[in-house]
Interface confidence: low
């Protein structure tokens, strides 16, 4: 006589801030009506009431008003619980009790997760490094859950396990910030990578830093520029770093410094005959005259535009000659996407809708991802177009065609691949049949 209540064996994984469905079902017997149904969801351990349905009516949420049943599906034996805006504190076991004439129950586990941010890397000390120096590299990643696994490796992919200290601290929402410190003795040069893994999401966030210790001058002037592109936001100022090692007795009168566009050889800025010859590039460049004598030949580029993107070569001539090229990568963040729906009213399950996600004035071209409320990627029936305006900034429009279920959340994520900046919007469509009492 016991009623068979079915729940998933595996934990339900839900991202913090999203909605989760805790599935629970039973088989209604002939003649079953909702008036006969008593349904209780409670926390398995504490027995705290979460949500109930009794006397033919949804008794509502007893859990911070963040739960809902699927009232139009109850009559078909679907006792699932929708938990909205999942928090870390929600993690645990929920028991679904169903009573009609007979009684049954089963427990389902909720596993909460949050992706870790792209790690930021810092170096201490961060200048005048020589082979043999000991440096401390810190890798920091934020707002993830559960606790992360952190891996370090060198440029060849060899794991670095010695001298690693990792700490993880939970904030008031229960999300973890992870800080991992690697102490390493520098070789001639080296790349050090930090990988932060979310064990539940199997999501890896990684960053790396390349350290090239300075070597002593050998005849030619050694001109040093950053290996990685300089990333500059449209409209801001960028510094293209370039340095050389002055010999004893060096004076600015001996210096010839030329900045030019690597590809076209167009002159950008120059310093010759002991004088700053000024900008040849739309009057938007400047040197750091007070620092030139110390070997700092860096160039300041003001009010960066998309058209500035590319390679700049720094030529330094004293008695000897040297040069190096630095890349400028221009970027502009995408706006928070606006979501439009067509049609946008009288939507019903089974209807085909067109959801348009629009984000504006970003650079470079975006990557667009769609996913449903469970975080499952939606790849079919997506058309994305990107159009550059006269400033070279892109407006992105991505169109998803989807057939509605009873209800659903559709999220659009517009990623700036250079800034690793994600802008996202979502739309929740509820088109379920009427049931009493109201819950929507």
């Amino acid at each position: 006589g016991a009623l068979e209540v079915q729940v998933p064996e595996d934990p339900v994984v839900a991202l913090v801030g999203t909605d989760a469905t805790l599935c629970c079902s039973f088989s209604p017997e002939p003649g079953f009506s909702l008036a006969q149904l008593n349904l209780i969801w409670q926390l398995t351990d504490t027995k705290q009431l979460v949500h109930s349905f009794a006397e033919g009516q949804d008794q509502g949420s007893a859990y911070a008003n963040r739960t809902a049943l699927f009232p139009d599906l109850l009559a078909q034996g679907n006792a699932s619980l929708r938990l909205q805006r999942v928090r870390v504190a929600d993690e645990g076991s929920f028991t679904c009790f169903v009573s009609i004439r007979d009684f049954g129950s089963a427990a389902v586990s909720l596993q909460v997760a949050a992706p870790y941010s792209k790690p930021s890397m810092t170096l201490e000390p961060n200048k005048d490094l020589r082979p043999g120096d000991t440096v401390t590299i810190t890798c920091s990643s934020y707002q993830g859950y559960p606790e992360a696994e952190v891996f370090w490796q060198d440029g060849q992919g060899v794991p670095l396990t010695g001298n690693v200290t990792t700490s993880q601290m939970a904030n008031e929402q229960g999300l973890f910030d992870v800080h991992s410190i690697l102490r390493v003795v520098l070789g001639a040069n080296g790349t050090y990578s930090c990988l932060v893994r979310n064990p539940v999401l199997q999501q890896d966030a990684h960053s790396s830093v390349t350290i090239t210790p300075q070597r002593s001058p050998t005849g030619a002037v050694e001109v040093q520029v950053p290996e990685d592109p300089v990333v500059a936001l449209v409209g801001t100022d960028a510094t293209l770093r370039c340095s050389f090692s002055p010999e004893p007795g060096f004076s600015l009168a001996q210096l010839n410094l030329i900045w030019q566009l690597t590809d076209t050889k167009q002159l950008v800025h120059s310093f010759t005959e002991g004088r700053d010859q000024g900008s040849a590039y739309a009057n938007r460049t400047a040197l750091f005259p007070d620092l030139l004598a110390q070997g700092n030949a860096s160039l300041r580029l003001q009010r960066v535009r998309v058209a500035d993107e590319g390679s700049f070569t720094c030529f330094v001539s004293i008695r000897d000659f040297g040069s190096a090229a630095v890349s400028l990568q221009v970027a502009a963040p995408y706006s928070k996407p606006s979501m439009t729906l067509e049609p946008n009213k009288d939507l019903r399950p089974g209807d085909t809708v067109t959801i348009t996600c629009s984000s504006y004035r970003g650079y470079p071209e975006a990557e667009v991802f769609w996913q449903d409320g469970q975080g499952v990627p939606l790849t079919g029936n997506v058309t994305t177009s990107q159009m550059a305006n006269e400033q070279g900034l892109f407006d992105v429009h991505s169109v998803l065609r989807v057939v509605l279920g009873a209800n659903g959340t559709y999220s659009c994520l517009v990623r700036n691949p250079v800034l690793q900046q994600d802008a996202h919007g979502s739309v929740t469509i509820t088109g379920q049949p009427m049931t009493f009492p109201p819950e929507a």
Epitope: G60, D72, Q76, R348, G350, M434, A440
Partner: antibody, heavy 119, light 112 residues
């Protein structure tokens, strides 16, 4: 466009039965519930209950339990109201009205069916 | 059951003048989800009722903006800023917070 078309007027004797139909068009019938509302002559509106068109489960207001039956034929997108053992006080206009699906209102109504019970 | 009481019973109005109808419920109409399911319907002479306002203050599609709804808890009001001849009929308030859904007794708006 959404339409609810009800069957024509009925004149019945006390003790007889009547079956009123409500044919829906212009939307997916099984996506939204249907309500039944009674209006006695010169009186206001009374909500009789509703039927879940997805599963066929009816819900009746207390005063309409027993002699009143809501049913469906989803193959022809039609809902029915059957009243048995008719009494003089059942004389009224009976309306079917669609749930809007979001706000717990009745957004589209049939034109009404007049049922007159008289000996 | 929730009792809905409307006043006045009859409301004669001159075209172009404003009109106001009151509706009071015997219990609060705030649902446990914090939403208030109070609606207004108009039944024009010889016609079926039609939805005017849903959830206290939201005009249904096609309803002129001279109609507005307000209120909270147990006291609600429907206002017509400038009555027109086509506005005549019986106005009903209705609640769907509690089952069974119930209607007010109606207010008959007439043109003077």
């Amino acid at each position: 466009q959404v339409q609810l078309v009800q069957s024509g007027s009925e004149l019945k004797k006390p003790g007889a039965s009547v079956k009123v139909s409500c044919k829906a068009s212009g939307y997916t019938f099984t996506n939204l519930g249907l309500n039944w509302v009674r209006q006695a002559p010169g009186q206001g509106l009374e909500w009789m209950g509703w039927i879940n068109t997805a599963g066929g489960q009816p819900t009746y207001a207390e005063d309409f339990k027993g002699r009143f039956v809501f049913s469906l034929d989803t193959s022809v997108s039609t809902a029915y109201l059957q009243i048995s053992s008719l009494k003089a006080e059942d004389t009224a206009v009976y309306y079917c009205a669609r749930d809007d699906g979001y706000y717990y209102t009745m957004d589209y109504w049939g034109q009404g069916t007049t049922v007159t019970v008289s000996s | 059951d929730i009792v809905m009481t409307q006043s006045p019973l009859s409301l004669p109005v001159t075209p172009g003048e404003p009109a106001s109808i009151s509706c009071r419920s015997s219990q609060s109409l705030v649902h446990s989800n914090a939403k208030t399911y109070l609606h207004w319907y108009l039944q024009k002479p010889g016609q079926s009722p039609q939805l005017l306002i849903y959830k206290v203050s939201n005009r249904f599609s096609g309803v002129p903006d001279r109609f507005s709804g307000s209120g909270s808890g147990t006291d609600f009001t429907l206002k017509i800023s400038r009555v027109e001849a086509e506005d005549v009929g019986v106005y009903y308030c209705s609640q769907s917070t509690h089952v069974p859904w119930t209607f007010g007794g109606g207010t008959k708006l007439e043109i003077k």
